[in-house]
């Protein structure tokens, strides 16, 4: 005989959940036990069926999950799986919130990415930090130079994709430049896109040959000679 | 070719439901967000809702909140509209507009591709 | 919402010459990223709305160079500098900043 426990935790780890009204929201609870355990969900501490929402709740036992289709305000509160047997119970809690904000492209916060100059063999860091009211994915670009021309006939730039990433609003995407070389010098942009649209800006990386350390002793004795 | 076509639109009585389709080709369609815009007769454009590349992601209109709901199938490149409770207010030609890439784009981000729009009238 | 008014209602021109249609945003349209998100179509008889101008004042491809767009925050023109006959239509401001997305209440453009 075994207590319950979780068997994807990795799965839960994220505990709010901050969604556009009209979204679908599900909330899982994967566990096993011996004997097998039972789910039932409390909401805000309240056993929790559904019979007074719009549109009911969808209970999938064999999956562990609670399913509330085109969720509205009322729906905001913290949500407990519950999953117990003969030798035990665990609980965890989801905390929802339901955005009624105007929904816009996403900001991307002034200055960053920040114009940045590295020496050849250092790393390099550029920040990008997004605020979205939808879930933001975030591309990192390198504009690129081909036969020559930073442009294409069409006007447009030429571009290589260095990163996707999907995020959460409002966190710090970073962009890792390891062992930096001249080449890695030039214009890098982070663009941000959710449902409404795309949000760019730019920043270059300016890389600097080696420090001569003959040269770099020698140089506070030069600024004072004649 | 960049393509979309609508269809599912017919004459329905008020209270009814209808599902609008929006068969998509000629682009990667799970890599864009898409959008349904309705125009009445003699009217202009109203935008209805939006759904994210993935379908994670949804906006409606006020005017159309509770009552339809967008949604799509990657898997047959089609974007869903289901309209129920639909009221005389509802009368109006549907059409499917692609919305803003995953990724870097060259031109606008969307708002480009329109579709030739489906009639939907409703009538008793 | 965003409130999008487009003035004037109809515009009636001669062939050959100059036409002027203006939108004013309830808000500003001019993002973080400095861009600003208005779009103009144009809507011709029985057809869905064409792109012609995006990002205030991005000719989209295809479009004519007769059509130009400008203005900035709130303040937005869409100018013809030769009406042509197949520039008969109705136009429409767009903001593409924000959801709900909203439109102009557009503009008739006659051939005199």
């Known amino acids: 005989q075994q207590a319950p426990y979780w068997t994807h935790p990795q799965r839960m780890e994220k505990k709010l959940h901050a969604v556009p009204a009209g979204n679908t929201v599900k909330f899982r609870c994967p566990a096993a036990g011996n004997p097998t355990p039972t789910i039932r969900w409390l909401k805000d501490g309240q056993a929790f069926h559904g019979e007074n929402r719009i549109g009911g709740i969808r209970l999938r036992h064999q999956h562990w999950s609670l399913v509330m289709e085109s969720v509205v305000p009322s729906d905001r509160g913290t949500y407990t799986c519950l999953v117990e047997n003969a030798v035990g119970s665990i609980r965890y809690n989801y905390l929802l919130d339901v955005l009624e904000r105007s929904p816009h492209r996403p900001i991307l916060q002034a200055g960053l990415p920040a114009n940045t100059t590295a020496v050849v063999g250092s790393d390099v860091e550029l920040l990008c930090k997004v605020y979205s009211d939808a879930q933001p994915h975030i591309q990192w670009l390198k504009h690129i130079v081909i036969n020559g021309s930073s442009f294409g006939a069409d006007g447009f730039p030429y571009v290589q994709v260095l990163k996707t990433a999907d995020i959460n609003s409002s966190e710090v995407e970073v962009l890792y430049l390891r062992n930096v070389s001249a080449e890695d010098a030039g214009e890098y942009t982070c663009l941000a896109g959710n449902s409404i649209g795309l949000s760019y800006q730019s920043a270059w990386l300016t890389v600097l040959p080696e420090e001569d350390p003959t040269w770099t002793a020698a140089a506070p004795e030069a600024r004072y000679t004649d | 070719e960049v393509q979309l076509v609508e269809s599912g639109g017919g004459v329905v009585q008020p209270g009814r439901s209808l599902r609008l389709s929006c068969a998509a080709s000629?682009?990667?369609?799970?890599?864009?967000?898409m959008h349904w815009v309705r125009q009445a007769p003699g009217k202009g454009l109203e935008w209805v809702a939006v759904i994210s590349y993935d379908g994670s992601n949804k906006y409606y209109a006020d005017s159309v909140k509770g009552r339809f709901t967008i949604s799509r199938d990657n898997s047959k490149n089609t974007l869903y509209l289901q309209m129920n409770s639909l009221r005389a207010e509802d009368t109006a030609i549907y059409y499917c507009?692609?919305?803003?890439?995953?990724?870097?784009?060259?031109?606008?981000?969307?708002?480009?591709?329109w579709g030739q729009g489906t009639m939907v009238t409703v009538s008793s | 919402d965003i409130v999008m008014t487009q003035t004037p209602l109809s515009l009636s021109v001669t062939p050959g010459q100059p036409a002027s249609i203006s939108c004013t945003s309830s808000r500003s349209l001019l993002h973080s990223d400095g861009k600003t998100y208005v779009y103009w179509y144009v809507q011709k008889s029985g057809q869905p709305p064409q792109l012609l101008i995006y990002e205030l004042s991005n000719r989209f491809s295809g479009v004519p160079d007769r059509f130009s767009g400008s203005g900035s925050r709130t303040d937005f023109t869409l100018k013809i500098s030769r009406v042509e006959a197949e520039d008969v239509g109705v136009y429409y401001c767009m903001q593409y900043i924000e959801a709900p997305l909203t439109f102009g209440g557009g503009t008739k453009v006659e051939i005199k």
């Open positions: 507009v692609r919305g803003a890439g995953r990724g870097y784009t060259y031109g606008p981000d969307g708002f480009d591709i």
């Open positions: 000629g682009f990667t369609f799970s890599s864009y967000a």
